[in-house]
Interface confidence: low
């Protein structure tokens, strides 16, 4: 037999096995030219000392053979024996160490077997009712196709599905959409109508999210404030990364999954905006506010489930950096400066009802006074911080005040309200003996003592009424007693005890009297 | 005026540490993040992490993760940057960057240090 | 990683001309984009930060704009000073990442 023909005859070696694991697989015949045909295959196992024969049988029963060699791919013409225009049957059988092993059968019109290509360029991903709809251009001159799609998932198997005839300039596939993992794809075409003509080359992989994107598992760390008012937010954790089946794990566009960090500022209502998205891998800068961070997940498909932490507000406070100046015009707040054009948001709350909603009020931009300082001032009828208790204040500033991630805090303080001198007298103030010449005062605490660091000291005085001397006894704000000592017996005395906070002396309290009796001896 | 003054150039061995240093002066050390970024011999510019000097937090390039420490001395104003296990395509010159207030973008750099790795 | 790239690589003018070099991030910054200039064997010196906003010091001569993914620097009246080589950046996302580079030469 000539080489470029099909051989009439048996050919060299004993009959096939096709029983097994190894040996010729996927075996495709298409035109290629006008009088031009080719047939290619897969060998799995061993090559060395195979030799394959592509075996082909005419409508008639009449077989014949082509010799191959070691070679995978043969290409004939019109001429070499196989009839083009009838149905024809091949398939390919491997001779190799004493026996034989043969693929599975095609039968086909080799003349209408045209080599179609797979789906090309673009594939379009969307959802449709809960499906998944995937859409391409139709490859050129390749109108009416049968389309095939495979599919697989990190942990499963590839697993095959149909499309459908299609016979449009675009094509489509519904396929199924997994919930909770990701998927790749792929896609084949043949030609519509032709049974035994041979499959494309599967499509490169279209890699598709889990409709659901993952709950983003991350933990933040806040750093301290520091002196510019500022705390960086920091990852400690990243998104665990999604798990990819094998053709995803490259560059592969389309699975991402992205990540947004919104920032929302709870302190200061009164401000231009309270919230902001930004990527998470820009970590912001924060004031000392309190905020809510939420990280949301989204992928091709849309947004999916977030997760929330709450920041709490920086406690500490600054020791006195705001002076209030209360006059018969009104209240006046100062407090070191920041740059020019800087807008100040005040915001104060009753201290033990943190729940409620802050007074909050937004400066102008300011430039700082001569002296430096920072100020807002309001009236007396606003009746702001006007009840007799204890207030936070918080000040925060921005050159920006639009742009949320650039607010600092400026400090954060306490302040009794009202006429703190007269509601910051201590009450209850009782005397007991304590020796033969001295006695122990006691009082209750001043409702100063209820705002940290504003009750300086309390002064006890103690006047003779004999001589009109009188002293006067410094005691740690902590402390609710003080002994005083070096007293004359049988000599009246009247104590009185004040609270003083930095910038205001306190309103003694009611005279107490009091003398140690003369002991008389026996 | 602001200024960020470096160490002076280092030879060192493949595998061995390198340890630059950056003072400040002319501003409150401790109020703004210090950022190194380094420059390979003709080549372009590459970012390698910052340091808050008001508390040692650090953040370093994933590149870099492992290899490199920043700290800080406070009361001297100085930050430092070592790179270990070095290679010789580590040969650069390393500069510090000052990150400005209000926006992480950077204002003011140091003279640069060359480390040169060769055995 | 945000690439950027910066074009053209390399360009002559005269002293006196306009120039504009362009820088391109391969995903959308905002405005998080600043501009250096580093003359041979020197630091590089801050130009432009927040894409359009001048450093203090730097003459007005010096200029940006742009936002998301493109960028571009311009320098009127060229000074021999200015001859240089310009690098972009990104300080939006970690790693802060640098453009390659555009050499500014006397023609």
């Known amino acids: 037999c000539r080489t470029s023909e099909c051989c009439f005859q048996d050919p060299p070696y004993s009959d096939a096995d096709s029983g097994s694991a190894s040996g010729p697989r996927d075996l495709s015949c298409y035109r290629i030219s006008s009088a031009g045909y080719e047939c290619s295959w897969q060998y799995e196992g061993p090559t060395a000392g195979v030799s394959h024969f592509l075996r082909c049988c005419l409508s008639s029963g009449r077989c014949c053979y082509f010799a191959t060699g070691s070679a995978t791919r043969l290409q004939f013409s019109d001429q070499a024996g196989v009839s083009v225009l009838h149905t024809v049957t091949l398939w390919v059988e491997s001779w190799a160490r004493n026996r034989t092993e043969k693929s599975p059968e095609v039968t086909l019109q080799l003349y209408k077997s045209v080599k179609y290509k797979p789906p090309l360029g673009d594939i379009k991903v969307s959802k449709l009712a809960g499906q998944l709809r995937m859409e391409w251009e139709t490859p050129d001159n390749q109108v009416g196709a049968e389309v095939q799609f495979r599919h697989r998932t990190p942990s499963s198997s590839w697993k095959l599905g149909d499309c459908g005839p299609q016979d449009d300039d675009t094509e489509s596939c519904l396929c199924p959409l997994e919930m909770n993992v990701a998927q790749e794809f792929q896609l084949r075409r043949r030609r519509l109508g032709s049974q035994g003509s041979s499959w494309s080359k599967w499509s490169s992989p279209v890699c598709v999210p889990p409709e659901n994107p993952p709950q983003p598992q991350v933990r933040f760390s806040v750093e301290q404030l520091g002196r510019d008012g500022r705390r960086r937010l920091t990852l400690k954790e990243q998104p665990t990364q999604l798990e990819l089946p094998e053709g995803c794990q490259g560059p592969a566009p389309g699975v991402e999954v992205t990540y947004q960090l919104q920032l929302h500022m709870l302190s200061c209502p009164c401000k231009a905006k309270a919230t902001r998205t930004l990527p998470l891998e820009k970590m912001p800068y924060l004031s000392g506010a309190a905020y809510n961070v939420a990280v949301i997940s989204s992928n091709r498909f849309g947004p999916g489930p977030n997760q929330t932490w709450h920041i709490p507000a920086d406690t500490h406070t600054e020791p006195v950096a705001l002076n209030i100046s209360v006059g018969t015009n009104g209240t006046t707040m100062y407090w070191p400066a920041r740059a020019q054009s800087t807008t100040y948001c005040i915001e104060w709350q009753p201290v033990g009802q943190e729940g409620s909603l802050a007074t909050c009020n937004l400066t102008a931009p300011q430039d700082p006074d001569p002296a430096g300082m920072a100020t807002y001032s309001w009236s007396r009828e606003s009746g702001a911080m006007g009840q007799e208790k204890c207030y936070h204040i918080t000040i925060f500033a921005s050159a920006h005040p639009k742009k949320l991630t650039l607010w600092s805090t400026v400090l954060s303080t306490y302040h009794f309200g009202g006429n703190a001198s007269a509601a910051g007298t201590p009450h209850h103030v009782s005397v007991k003996n304590h020796s033969l010449d001295s006695v122990s005062v006691d009082w209750a605490p001043s409702l100063l003592s209820t705002c940290p660091g504003v009750l300086k000291e309390y002064v006890v005085r103690c006047r003779d009424e004999d001589s009109n001397q009188v002293s006067e006894h410094p005691v740690q704000p902590t402390e609710t007693q003080v002994t005083l000592s070096d007293l004359r017996a049988g000599v009246a005395y009247t104590v009185q005890v004040r609270a003083d906070t930095a910038w205001l002396r306190g309103a003694w309290s009611q005279p107490q009297r009091f003398s140690i009796k003369v002991q008389v001896s026996d | 005026q602001v200024q960020l003054v470096q160490s002076g150039a280092e030879v060192k061995k493949p595998g061995a540490s390198a340890k630059v240093s950056c003072k400040a002066s002319g501003y409150t050390f401790t109020d703004y993040y210090l950022h190194w970024v380094r420059q390979a011999p003709g080549q372009g510019l590459e970012w390698m992490g910052w340091i808050n000097p008001n508390n040692g937090g650090t953040h370093y390039a994933q590149k870099f993760q492992g290899r490199v420490t920043m700290t800080r001395d406070t009361s001297i104003s100085t930050a430092y940057m070592e790179l270990s296990r070095l290679r010789s395509d580590d040969t650069a010159v390393y500069y510090c960057a000052r990150e400005m207030g209000g926006t992480t973008a950077f204002d003011y750099w140091g003279q640069g240090t060359l480390v040169t790795v060769s055995s | 990683d945000i690439q950027m790239t910066q074009s053209p690589s390399s360009l002559s003018a005269s002293v006196g001309d306009r120039v504009t070099i362009t820088c391109r991030a391969s995903q959308g910054i905002g405005n998080y984009l600043a501009w250096f200039q580093q003359r041979p064997g020197k630091a590089p010196k801050s130009l432009i930060y927040?894409?359009?906003s001048l450093q203090s010091g730097v003459p007005s001569k010096f200029s940006g704009s742009g936002s998301g993914t493109d960028f571009t620097l311009t320098i009127s009246s060229l000074q021999p000073a200015d001859f240089a080589i310009y690098y972009c950046?990104?300080?939006?996302?970690?790693?802060?990442?640098f453009g390659p580079g555009t050499r500014l030469e006397i023609k």
């Open positions: 950046q990104q300080y939006n996302i970690y790693p802060y990442t």
């Open positions: 927040a894409a359009s």
